[in-house]
Interface confidence: low
């Protein structure tokens, strides 16, 4: 917003106008207009000779503007010479600009037909358990005037959840400076926002337009079970589709899968609607949509629709999801060499083959750098020649390996360590 | 939008669930929930033993998730062990999750009371001189169904100038698939935008909600005088202020200053409203606002309001805006030295003092680097010793310099040049 008092010089012609005289024979004026303005209107420099006499001044296009800068990139400078015979120290010239045709617009305003009542102020919310009282005030001028009385007015309260648009907001009308919103108006555990405007009551002698909206007020509705799906709505397109939507908290939707179920009559079987489309709704909710086919609206005019957790199942086949218990491992010394021996927990089914993975390493190495061997259905493994006077570690794991059976490796057995003997010097 | 078919696994518990068995005595399951979900709802792992028997599985908190990654930053891993005596190659376990309380919502939809008619399609604009015809179509399903008939519907057309908000848009109702907008609806030389939605007609047996809005259509209204102020509106607050606003093309406002003038009755004197507030309105227009005081609405119930060019004047006093004609300059040689002499155009008023500014320079210098002298009421100046065999230039300008008189320097005189004589060598 910019403010200008009546009389403020603001046009480019007036801003740029400069007039100098030689105090003998003439006045020279320079000013500028803009190319953009000239497309729409031409203005003429006017000299007021006295209270009644306005004289147009003839001006030519000019190449420069030596006396003032033009505040616009596409200025059109002009220069005008006004012959003048007499100069007195008290002389003042009055210059203005006049458009090349009458410009303006006019309106006759009958006050009773052009009323915009004052906007509600001090909009506040107070709570009484699960009811919410909106109150506001409206300034009707001095009480003695009585031109606009409370009976001329009504109030339009619109309210919505924070995440919804005003276009879809609900409306309440009130003929007092308050309105009550109860559980029938509000969804639980939601943040609401409301605003109010003043309207002229239908029976009033006055007409015009509503006030501006009041500033908004926010509040949290009555607490409720936030895990429940909310705002289930269904609308029939009049042809063949019943479109339903509902909302779920994002955190709940991450743990519980909801479906839309419907019956075209109370005694029909329940069916699940598919596909479900999802969209984010603010930061807290997800809105879900699904379209139910309506093959015969004339026969089945009432649908029972529900949102329920879906029994979404995971099917896990035992024989391909086996993880055996880890083997138990021992280390034995056979003469100069070492062997690893292990046992698996007895399985009820002896036809299932086992694959073993054996790792052994020096104490100074990591399992990542260990030696790894894979054996089929074996329960022992002779180790190759090892370094003397060294601590070693070994571990083993098992998995099933027969066609038709699968799974993942068992956990590793408990790791076993042993020290190899020192070698006697040969002297 | 995301799409999910009924049955798609989408919850985090189901995504993360992995179960492995030792094919002998037990099944071990691991899964995760989120801290955020737990605040609102707890879910339990359920094993379906057969078609009718669902068994909850007891699970403990776990420190890790070795079998799957959790797609959420705040996961809570769990581990469950299910004893199991018998394993067969055809065994399949069915696992699901169940919330800790009944969740869901239910709606009985009577189709006739939950109708949202289809949105208008193919919205188009055509022109006939200064009238504009909006046409559209609406799909009502197969003709033989007759469930929703054209008589059940009406259309809400809203239209506005591009720069206005939909909240302030005008509304037209139509019971056919077209609407005509004429000069009485549209301001000239403006770009308009319209949209349409389908509503249930007041006399219909059906209820519900309007359709979505159609896509928008744009057009340019009939041409007009774009320099004219437009959209003058005034509204009385019912107390003491008549608020008026009007719009002007930005280019016009840069050259013509408009004011708001008012009379509280036809025979009252016209007054100008102040202050005027301005705001941008799109890229082409400026909206102006002013508030007219209404001291006595009961007595003066009709105001005549007009927007007109203001005679914004610039007052220019002759005696302080003098620019004399440039002097005429000559150079004379007096013996070995040079003098500058000048004359000013004869002024009618001899009592006005003159100040002269004289500049002289060598041919090789610029005026910026010249010697400058200032003299009062003089008409000549002797030059100091100059370099021999050198071309010099001089110029002079004049301004008034008496108390009560002011102005700006004249233009420079025509510059004069001369060559100094060479000096004979002394031998």
């Amino acid at each position: 917003w910019e403010r200008s008092l009546a009389g403020a010089e603001e046009t480019i012609p007036l801003q740029t106008l400069r007039c100098y005289n030689d105090y003998t024979s003439h006045i020279t004026c320079r000013w500028a207009d803009t190319q953009d303005a000239q497309r729409l209107v031409n203005v003429t420099l006017i000299r007021r000779v006295n209270e009644d006499l306005l004289e147009p001044v003839s001006c030519d296009l000019s190449d420069d503007m030596p006396w003032s800068a033009c505040p616009h990139p596409r200025c059109v400078p002009r220069r005008c010479v006004i012959p003048c015979q007499s100069f007195v120290v008290t002389d003042v010239d009055y210059f203005s600009f006049q458009p090349d045709r009458p410009l303006g617009t006019r309106l006759t305003v009958t006050l009773t037909q052009h009323v915009q009542p004052p906007e509600p102020r001090d909009l506040q919310i107070s709570t009484d358990q699960d009811h919410f009282l909106l109150t506001w005030s409206v300034a009707l001028g001095s009480p003695q005037s009585h031109w606009l009385s409370p009976g001329d007015l009504e109030f339009e309260v619109v309210y919505k959840r924070l995440q919804d648009s005003w276009e879809d907001a609900a409306i309440l009308l009130s003929n007092t400076s308050q309105a009550t919103l109860g559980p029938e108006h509000l969804m639980p555990s939601s943040t609401y926002v409301a605003r109010v405007r003043t309207r002229l009551a239908p029976g009033s002698r006055l007409s015009g337009r509503p006030s501006k909206w009041s500033p908004e007020v926010c509040w949290d509705s009555q607490p409720g079970d936030e895990a429940q799906p909310q705002n289930l709505e269904c609308f029939f397109d009049g042809a063949a589709v019943l479109s339903c939507s509902w909302e779920v908290r994002k955190e709940v939707a991450s743990s519980v899968s909801f479906g839309l179920f419907y019956k075209p009559s109370p005694d029909a079987g329940e069916e699940e609607c598919s596909p479900v489309l999802r969209e984010g709704l603010g930061s807290l909710h997800t809105r879900h949509h699904c379209q139910i086919p309506v093959p015969d609206p004339a026969t089945h005019g009432q649908y029972i629709v529900s949102v329920q957790p879906r029994r979404a199942e995971k099917h896990i086949k035992s024989s391909v999801n086996i993880q055996m218990a880890p083997p138990s491992l021992n280390v034995t010394k056979d003469g100069d060499s070492y062997s690893l021996r292990w046992e698996t927990m007895k399985m009820r089914y002896e036809h299932i083959d086992h694959t073993f993975e054996i790792q052994y390493r020096k104490d100074t190495a990591t399992w990542k750098d260990s030696k790894t061997e894979t054996l089929q259905n074996a329960h022992s493994m002779a180790l190759p020649a090892l370094e003397p006077s060294t601590r070693y570690w070994a571990r083993v794991r098992v998995r099933t390996s027969r066609t038709g059976y699968n799974g993942i490796w068992s956990e590793w057995s408990e790791a076993r360590s042993w020290d190899t003997e020192s070698v006697l010097p040969m002297w | 939008w995301e799409r999910s078919l009924a049955g798609a696994e989408e919850t985090i518990p189901l995504q993360t669930l992995r179960c492995y068995n030792d094919y002998t005595s037990h099944i071990t399951c691991r899964w995760a929930d989120t801290q955020d979900a737990q605040r609102l709802v707890n879910v339990t792992l359920i094993r379906r033993v057969n078609e009718d028997l669902l068994e909850p599985v007891s699970c403990d908190l776990s420190d890790d998730m070795p079998w799957s990654a959790c797609p959420h930053p705040r996961c809570v891993p769990r581990r469950c062990v299910i004893p199991c005596q018998s394993f067969v190659v055809t065994d399949v376990d069915y696992f699901s999750f169940q919330p800790d309380r009944p969740l869901g919502t239910r709606l009985t939809v009577t189709l006739t009371q939950h109708v949202q008619p289809p949105e208008p399609r193919d919205l188009q604009i055509s022109t006939d001189q200064d009238h504009f015809l909006l046409t559209w179509s609406v799909a009502l399903g197969s003709p033989q169904s007759h469930w929703l008939s054209p008589g059940d519907l009406e259309f809400e057309v809203v239209y506005k100038r591009l720069q206005d908000s939909w909240e302030d848009a005008a509304i037209l109702l139509s019971n056919t698939s077209q609407a005509t907008l004429g000069p009485e609806h549209l301001m000239p030389s403006s770009t308009y935008v319209a949209r349409v939605r389908t509503r249930l007609a007041p006399g219909s047996r059906l209820s519900g909600r309007p359709s979505k809005w159609s896509p928008e259509v744009c057009w340019d209204s009939q041409p007009g005088d774009e320099a004219q102020p437009q959209n003058l509106e005034c509204f009385f607050d019912g107390a003491a202020v008549l608020s008026c606003s009007w719009e002007v093309r930005k280019e016009v406002a840069s050259s013509v200053s408009f004011g708001l003038f008012y009379k509280p009755s036809p025979d009252a004197g016209e007054e100008e409203c102040s202050p005027v507030l301005r705001e941008g309105l799109g890229s082409l227009h400026t909206r102006h606002h002013c508030q007219i005081p209404v001291p006595d609405p009961a007595t003066h119930g009709q105001y005549i309001v007009s927007v007109q060019p203001r005679r914004a004047e610039k007052h220019i006093k002759s005696s302080v805006n003098i620019q004399m004609a440039p002097p005429s300059l000559n150079v004379t040689k007096d013996g070995d030295s040079y003098s500058l002499r000048w004359e000013t155009m004869k002024m009618r008023y001899e009592h006005i003092d003159h100040t002269f500014e004289i500049q002289y320079r060598k041919d090789t210098a610029t005026w910026k680097d010249s010697k400058t002298e200032t003299l009062q009421n003089a008409h000549s100046m002797a030059l100091p010793a100059l370099e021999p065999s050198t071309r010099y230039w001089a110029r002079v300008r004049v301004r008034t310099s008496r108390t009560g008189y002011n102005g700006i320097w004249s233009e420079w005189s025509e510059a004069r040049s001369w060559d100094t004589e060479s000096v004979l060598p002394m031998w």
């Epitope: 917003w1 001028g141 500033p215 908004e216 926010c218 | 107390a239 202020v241 202050p275 507030l277």
Partner: antibody, heavy 122, light 107 residues
Framework: EVQLVESGGGLVKPGGSLRLSCEAS????????MNWVRQAPGKGLEWVSS????????YYADSVKGRFTISRDIAKNSLYLQINSLRAEDTAVYYC???????????????WGRGTLVTVSS | EIVLTQSPATLSLSPGERATLSCRAS??????LAWYQQKPGQAPRLLIY???NRATGIPARFSGSGSGTDFTLTISSLEPEDFAVYYC?????????FGGGTKVEIK
Amino acid sequence: EVQLVESGGGLVKPGGSLRLSCEASGFTLSSYTMNWVRQAPGKGLEWVSSIRSSSSFIYYADSVKGRFTISRDIAKNSLYLQINSLRAEDTAVYYCARDYYGSGSYWYFDLWGRGTLVTVSS
Amino acid sequence: EIVLTQSPATLSLSPGERATLSCRASQSVSSYLAWYQQKPGQAPRLLIYDASNRATGIPARFSGSGSGTDFTLTISSLEPEDFAVYYCQQRSNWPLTFGGGTKVEIK
């Protein structure tokens, strides 16, 4: 030049009274909503009182209600604040401020005076 | 009453740096919030009104944003004359209230 100049501050004992003046020049004070805002030494700003351009609307902060009175003299183009029953916590620089929106009454302040200091001390 | 909390209390920055000042309302004030600058010994000066509109004559380096309860004043590149105390003010509800101020000082 458009400006506001406050005067009338000074040292006063608890329970005492003062009348602060604010003289406007360069604009018509009665065309604007006018306000008093104060600032205790080294502290932030506190709104005190407002008078709408129509004069029919006057507002006060709870802390001064019943003790302070805002008024104006159209002929003198001046705004006043009569302050009675002064307390130590009323010690502050008192600024006169013009509303940004003229008779639209916007409740933001675009033109301020330099302030006048009121000290309440025994 | 609506309480406006400004943070930080003090911001130490060098000329040319970007300054971000915060103002939080105890309840929604929609976009009805202004920012002022005050230098020692001087009256406040209106910078921004209605959360994001620059007042007349205010340089483009000052910008405001936010609505509801959280608002920000940004000075894109600090000039020496920008070191001052900044206050926010709401007009959503009576009484009109100001924040406690943020002092922007030279580092």
